[in-house]
C-alpha cells in the first residue's frame, strides 16, 4: 500500500529529475566559433568566411554542426546569434590598395530546402585609415534573437578579409538557443 | 486509500514546484554592473577598471560575487558576457595628449587556481579625435557565450580610461548564466 | 488499488508536462522589432522612433506588445535588451547639412505608474562624413540585462533619423527574458 | 602619369659618401612603403632598404646595415639613401620603389607596383 506508493513516488521524482535534467542541459545548443586564421582569403572584395574553430581555447559547439564554414542548427529554437569582427592594419604590413575602406560583416541564414540566403544582421563602418598612423583599428559587433529551423544554416561573410585580426578573443561568431518554438 | 494517494501527488506537485522554481530562479546567476565614476584611473595607458557598481540604478547582482573590482562566478555554467563602454571628450575638460588615439575594452578571465589571466573579448577602433571638432564620442560593445568555473573571476581593461564616460547607460557589463555544463 | 495509482502517476506525469512546458514555453516573452522604413522621421535632431515591424520578415513579438511606438512589457522578469541601429549616406541622395556628425542611440524605459523615461543603454560615435567619400556607414551595436516590470515601455531614441538604413537585417531592437524576479 | 625619378648617382671612392634621392610625381605616396633595390652587373636584381609611411620601421638588408640608412619626406613626396662606407660591391644601379602590396614582404620586388628608372653608382677601389 503506502509503500507501493513512495516507490511510485520515487519513480515520478526520478523520471522527472531524468526528464527535466535532460530537456534543461541537452535541449540547449550553443556554439562559440573562434576565426582559424591560417586560412583567411585575401583581397578587399565580399567574402564568406569558411575556417573557424570550434573546439580549440573560447571555441565550443554542442548540438550544433559546424562543416563546410558553417554552423548548421540541428534543433528547431528561437536563438541568440552574435557575432564580433575585428580589423586590423599595421603599416609593416605593407600598403592598403586604398586608404578609403567599408570594413563590414554580414550574419547570413541559408536554407537547403529552398535553397536561398538571407542576411539577418549587418554592421560595420566605412574608415578612413590614413597613412599618417602606424596602426588601425576596429571591431564590429551585431547580435539579435531568431527563429532557426532544423537544417538552417549560420555563415559570416565580411569585407576586406586580409584585415581581420585572427585572435580568438577579436573574431568570433556564436549561437545559443533561448527558448523552443511553441 | 485514494485519499492518501491525492496528498502523495500533492505532494509530488509540490515539491516538484519547489524544485523547478528553485532551479529556474536561484540557478541563474546574473550580473550588470556600472561604472563607478568617482574612482576611474588617469592616463592613456591599458589599465583594470575595478571601481564598479552592483547595487544601484541599473546595476545589479545575483548568485555571483563583486570583489577587488572583479565579478566572480559563484556557479559553474556557461554564461553570456557583455561589455558596453562610451569614451567621450569635450574640449572644455581640455587638451588630449594626442589627437591619434586607440580605445579599447578587453574583457578578462582570471583563474584563480592556476593564476593566468586570458582575455575572452576584445573590441575598440583607433580614432583621430581632431582639435577642429568641440565634442568627440565612441562606443564599443562587445559580447560572446562562455564556460565559467566557480572562482574565475571576470575583469575589464580599458586604454584612455580619463575618457570614460562616467554614466551608468554609457558604460557597464555583465553576465547571466544561459545553460549547466553538462 | 495498483491500477488506480498508475492513473494518478499518468495525472502527476501529464500534468507536469504540461506545467514544465507551458512554463518553459509561454513563460518566455521575446519580441524582435525591425524599423519600418516608410515613417522615418527626418532631420539631424534627437527623435523617438515610432515604427517598427513585429510580424514581418525578421520581425516577431511573443508575451509582449507592441503600441504607439514602445515595446510594452506584459511579464514581469530580467531580460536581455539589444539594438542594432545602422546610419548611412550616399552622395546621391544630396548633401548633408554638417560634415560633422553625432550618430547615437538610446535605449529607454517609461514607466506609466510613475510617469518618467530613463536610458537604459547608449552608444554610438561622433563622425567626420567628408565630401571627398561618395558613400559612409556606421553601425551601433548595444545590449544589456535589465529587470523589467509588467507594463513598463522600451523605446529607441536616435540622432539624425534621415540617415538611418532601413533594411530589416541593419536597424532593429528586441528583447528576450531570461529568468523571472525573486 | 606616376614617375619616380632618382638621382644622386655619380662616381665614388671606397670609403666615401652619397647621398640618393628619389622623387614622386603623379600621385602621393605620403601613406606608401618606399624603398631602394640595386642590381650590380651581372648579378640578380636585390633588396637596399626601405622604410613605413610613418618611418617608424625600417628595413635593411644585411650588406648595407650600419652604413645605409634611408629616410623620407612626406611633405615633398620625397625618399632618400644616405651610403655612408662605400664599398665596390655597392657598385649597381639603384633604383627607388614605392607601394608595397599588402601582406607581402618588404624584401621582395614582385611586391611592389612601382619602379623608377634608376640611377648608377660606381664606387672604384
Known amino acids: 500500500g503506502s509503500q507501493h506508493i513512495r516507490a511510485e513516488k520515487a519513480m515520478v521524482d526520478g523520471s522527472w529529475l531524468d526528464l527535466a535534467k535532460r530537456s534543461k542541459l541537452e535541449a540547449q545548443p550553443f556554439a562559440h566559433l573562434t576565426i582559424n586564421a591560417t586560412d583567411i582569403p585575401s583581397g578587399s572584395h565580399k567574402v564568406s568566411l569558411s575556417s573557424w574553430y570550434h573546439d580549440r581555447g573560447w571555441a565550443k559547439i554542442s548540438n550544433m554542426t559546424f562543416s563546410n564554414g558553417k554552423l548548421i542548427v540541428n534543433q528547431d529554437g528561437f536563438y541568440y546569434l552574435y557575432a564580433n569582427i575585428c580589423f586590423r592594419h599595421h603599416e609593416t604590413s605593407g600598403d592598403l590598395a586604398t586608404e578609403y575602406l567599408q570594413l563590414m560583416v554580414y550574419v547570413t541564414k541559408t536554407s537547403i530546402k529552398i535553397p536561398s540566403s538571407h542576411t539577418l544582421m549587418k554592421g560595420g563602418s566605412t574608415k578612413y585609415w590614413s597613412g599618417n598612423s602606424e596602426f588601425h583599428f576596429y571591431s564590429i559587433n551585431v547580435g539579435g534573437f531568431f527563429k532557426l529551423r532544423s537544417g538552417e544554416e549560420i555563415s559570416i561573410e565580411v569585407s576586406n578579409p586580409s584585415l581581420l585580426d585572427p585572435d580568438q578573443d577579436a573574431t568570433y561568431f556564436g549561437a545559443f538557443k533561448v527558448r523552443d518554438i511553441d | 486509500g485514494s485519499q492518501h494517494i491525492r496528498a502523495e501527488k500533492a505532494m509530488v506537485d509540490g515539491s516538484w514546484l519547489d524544485l523547478a522554481k528553485r532551479s529556474k530562479l536561484e540557478a541563474q546567476p546574473f550580473a550588470h554592473l556600472t561604472i563607478n565614476a568617482t574612482d576611474i584611473p588617469s592616463g592613456s595607458h591599458k589599465v583594470s577598471l575595478s571601481s564598479w557598481y552592483h547595487d544601484r540604478g541599473w546595476a545589479k547582482i545575483s548568485n555571483m560575487t563583486f570583489s577587488n573590482g572583479k565579478l566572480i562566478v559563484n556557479q559553474d555554467g556557461f554564461y553570456y558576457l557583455y561589455a558596453n563602454i562610451c569614451f567621450r571628450h569635450h574640449e572644455t575638460s581640455g587638451d588630449l595628449a594626442t589627437e591619434y588615439l586607440q580605445l579599447m575594452v578587453y574583457v578578462t578571465k582570471t583563474s584563480i587556481k592556476i593564476p593566468s589571466s586570458h582575455t575572452l573579448m576584445k573590441g575598440g577602433s583607433t580614432k583621430y579625435w581632431s582639435g577642429n571638432s568641440e565634442f568627440h564620442f565612441y562606443s564599443i560593445n562587445v559580447g560572446g557565450f562562455f564556460k565559467l568555473r566557480s572562482g574565475e573571476e571576470i575583469s575589464i581593461e580599458v586604454s584612455n580610461p580619463s575618457l570614460l564616460d562616467p554614466d551608468q547607460d554609457a558604460t557597464y557589463f555583465g553576465a547571466f548564466k544561459v545553460r549547466d555544463i553538462d | 488499488g495498483s491500477q488506480h495509482i498508475r492513473a494518478e502517476k499518468a495525472m502527476v506525469d501529464g500534468s507536469w508536462l504540461d506545467l514544465a512546458k507551458r512554463s518553459k514555453l509561454e513563460a518566455q516573452p521575446f519580441a524582435h522589432l525591425t524599423i519600418n522604413a516608410t515613417d522615418i522621421p527626418s532631420g539631424s535632431h534627437k527623435v523617438s522612433l515610432s515604427s517598427w515591424y513585429h510580424d514581418r520578415g525578421w520581425a516577431k513579438i511573443s508575451n509582449m506588445t507592441f503600441s504607439n511606438g514602445k515595446l510594452i512589457v506584459n511579464q514581469d522578469g530580467f531580460y536581455y535588451l539589444y539594438a542594432n541601429i545602422c546610419f548611412r549616406h550616399h552622395e546621391t541622395s544630396g548633401d548633408l547639412a554638417t560634415e560633422y556628425l553625432q550618430l547615437m542611440v538610446y535605449v529607454t524605459k517609461t514607466s506609466i505608474k510613475i510617469p518618467s523615461s530613463h536610458t537604459l543603454m547608449k552608444g554610438g560615435s561622433t563622425k567626420y562624413w567628408s565630401g571627398n567619400s561618395e558613400f559612409h556607414f556606421y553601425s551601433i551595436n548595444v545590449g544589456g540585462f535589465f529587470k523589467l516590470r509588467s507594463g513598463e515601455e522600451i523605446s529607441i531614441e536616435v540622432s539624425n533619423p534621415s540617415l538611418l538604413d532601413p533594411d530589416q537585417d541593419a536597424t532593429y531592437f528586441g528583447a528576450f527574458k531570461v529568468r523571472d524576479i525573486d | 602619369e606616376v614617375q619616380l625619378v632618382e638621382s644622386g648617382g655619380g662616381l665614388v671612392q671606397a670609403g666615401g659618401s652619397l647621398r640618393l634621392s628619389c622623387a614622386a610625381s603623379?600621385?602621393?605616396?605620403?601613406?606608401?612603403?618606399m624603398g631602394w633595390f640595386r642590381q650590380p652587373p651581372g648579378n640578380e636584381r636585390e633588396f637596399v632598404a626601405a622604410?613605413?609611411?610613418?618611418?617608424?620601421?625600417?628595413y635593411y638588408a644585411d650588406s648595407v646595415k650600419g652604413r645605409f640608412t634611408i629616410s623620407r619626406d612626406n611633405a615633398k613626396n620625397t625618399v632618400s639613401l644616405q651610403m655612408n662606407s662605400l664599398k665596390f660591391e655597392d657598385t649597381a644601379a639603384y633604383y627607388c620603389?614605392?607601394?608595397?602590396?599588402?601582406?607581402?614582404?618588404?624584401?621582395?620586388?614582385?611586391?611592389?607596383?612601382?619602379w623608377g628608372q634608376g640611377t648608377q653608382v660606381t664606387v672604384s677601389s
Open positions: 603623379g600621385r602621393t605616396f605620403s601613406s606608401k612603403t
Open positions: 622604410i613605413t609611411p610613418t618611418s617608424r620601421t625600417t
Open positions: 620603389v614605392a607601394v608595397r602590396r599588402y601582406g607581402s614582404p618588404p624584401h621582395d620586388g614582385s611586391s611592389y607596383e612601382y
